[in-house]
Interface confidence: low
């Protein structure tokens, strides 16, 4: 059994354009043509002076995180595809990336998938409607928000000096005035006014695998959901956030683990 | 070279106890999970144990669970296989095998060690 | 338990002929990941049994091209092409998606 191994198949990277708004998940997908008996992943972005910076990396059934957490690996469960994401992307996470397999002794080869380009855009504050908005119909909502403000400002300017003459041409009519409500009768809320507080659960992993021995890092994102539970009515802790952030999910079997083979 | 070393293999009475020994060299031993094999004479293979590369998880086969405990030393590079209330059917040649996986496991056995349990 | 029925017991051929072992599983040993989880082994006499084919036809490293494996589902073939005297010794199908993982009762190569 010592003839050579048969030759390192190549690696795939996709898309190879990838567009985000900030604060969104960005993932690009690695894969091997074949599943490698032993083998070491890395995940890379081009620098500006075309040298490869190493963001994260896959090794035998163990993820090694880079220095920045939000660079995460996930292999899938046909061993084949890597899922590499970029957590809340930002702007300057703009950029070429590309991911390399090192298949390991006895016939140690390297090997570079194609690059990919990643555009992270500035986010609206608005979502972007069908049609665009024409300017002009833009210049006129502002125009009227100007007049309205002057108009008010205006208003507000000439009641001043209305009081200022009456105070001074009926200087005794104003001294006994109260200004204030009834002493019986305090201001009113609405008939539903109950006040309504929030318990803000963060992000919450909702998830039912088993623990495996990868560093704990949230899973990917089509398995996280966003909570917020609404209690109308009189609170226990009124203004008080509880967070649930740290109930941290189990991430998926490793591939060393096999398809479930632990039952625990 | 991966290589999986055994020991501790012996001839024991029933009800007795044995601890087999898997010396690794030649890859990250840390990285990956582990498994016991075992082989009767003129008989076919059966997995006995497994455990994850962090040693937090196991698997036994049925006939073994509760007499068997599998363990590693990820400092030292050592799985490790205590055999208590052991019985004659335990009688085999006893595999270290590198990984427990579908994918890439079961890719290197090591010498096996015997463990004979007669009166 | 998931029963593996190897077929021949025992095969005997002449160097540079073509060897064919089957497996047949009881169960499907797809997984819903489009994997099917079944390897081979070869076991030399007094030796530990070395892998030589898993996930069905993937080869282990060092392993020669003359090795390939095939099929799908409950069904499965290894054959050897330009046999060897080396290629004797005990063949072994398993399965590792059902939970106990079992394996084949062995063929047994020999040259004529």
């Known amino acids: 059994l010592d003839s050579p191994d048969r030759p390192w198949s190549p690696l795939t990277f996709s898309p190879a354009q990838l567009t985000v708004q900030e604060g969104e998940n960005a993932t690009f997908t690695c894969s091997l043509a074949d599943i490698p008996d032993s083998f070491v992943l890395n995940w890379y972005r081009l620098s500006p002076r075309n040298q490869t910076d190493k963001l994260a990396a896959f090794q035998e059934d163990r993820i090694e995180p880079g220095r920045d957490r939000r660079f995460r690996v996930t292999r899938l469960p046909n061993g084949r595809d890597f899922h590499m994401s970029i957590v809340a992307a930002r702007l300057n996470d703009s950029g070429i990336y590309l991911c390399g397999a090192i298949y390991l002794p006895p016939n140690t080869q390297i090997n570079e998938s194609p690059r990919a380009e990643l555009s992270v855009t500035e986010r609206t504050l608005e979502p972007p409607t069908q049609s665009p908005s024409p300017p002009p119909r833009l210049s006129g909502q502002l125009q009227g928000l100007v007049i309205g403000v002057t108009s008010v400002l205006v208003g507000v300017l000439l009641l001043l000096l209305l009081t200022w003459v009456l105070a001074a041409v009926f200087p005794r009519a104003t001294r006994g005035a109260c200004v204030c409500g009834s002493e019986d009768e305090p201001l009113k809320e609405g008939p539903d006014a109950a006040p309504v507080f929030t318990l803000d659960y963060g992000e919450l992993d909702f998830q039912w695998r088993e623990k495996t021995p990868e560093p704990p890092a949230p899973c990917a994102p089509e398995q996280t959901e966003y909570a917020t539970i609404v209690f109308p009515g009189r609170p226990a802790s009124p203004g008080r956030r509880a967070s649930a952030s740290s109930l941290q999910g189990a991430q998926p079997p490793s591939p060393e683990d096999g398809p479930g083979l632990w039952p625990l | 070279e991966v290589q999986l070393v055994e020991s501790g293999g012996d001839l024991v009475k029933p009800a007795g106890s044995l601890r087999l020994s898997c010396l690794a060299s030649?890859?990250?031993?840390?990285?990956?999970?582990m498994s016991w094999v075992r082989q009767a004479p003129e008989k076919g293979l059966h997995l006995v144990a497994g455990i994850n590369s962090d040693g937090d998880r196991t698997y036994y086969k049925d006939a073994v669970k509760g007499r068997f405990t599998i363990s590693r030393d990820n400092a030292k590079s050592i799985v490790y296989l205590q055999m208590n209330s052991l019985r004659v059917e335990d009688t085999a040649m006893y595999y270290c095998?590198?990984?427990?996986?579908?994918?890439?496991?079961?890719?290197?056995w090591g010498q096996g060690t015997l463990v004979t349990v007669s009166s | 338990d998931v029963v593996m029925t190897q077929t021949p017991l025992s095969l005997s051929v002449s160097p540079g002929e073509t060897a064919s072992i089957s497996c047949k599983a009881s169960q499907s040993l797809l997984h819903s990941d489009g994997n099917t989880y079944l390897t081979w082994f070869r076991q030399k006499p007094g030796q530990s049994p070395h892998r030589l084919v898993y996930?069905?036809?993937h080869r282990h490293p060092g392993v020669p091209d003359r090795f390939s494996g095939s099929g799908s589902g409950t069904d499965f073939t290894l054959r050897i092409s330009r046999v060897e005297a080396d290629d004797t010794g005990l063949y072994y199908c398993?399965?590792?998606?059902?939970?106990?993982?079992?394996f084949g009762a062995g063929t047994k190569v020999e040259l004529k």
């Open positions: 398993g399965q590792v998606i059902h939970d106990p993982w079992t």
């Open positions: 030649g890859f990250t031993f840390s990285s990956y999970s």
């Open positions: 996930a069905v036809s």
């Open positions: 095998v590198r990984g427990f996986s579908s994918f890439n496991g079961l890719g290197y």
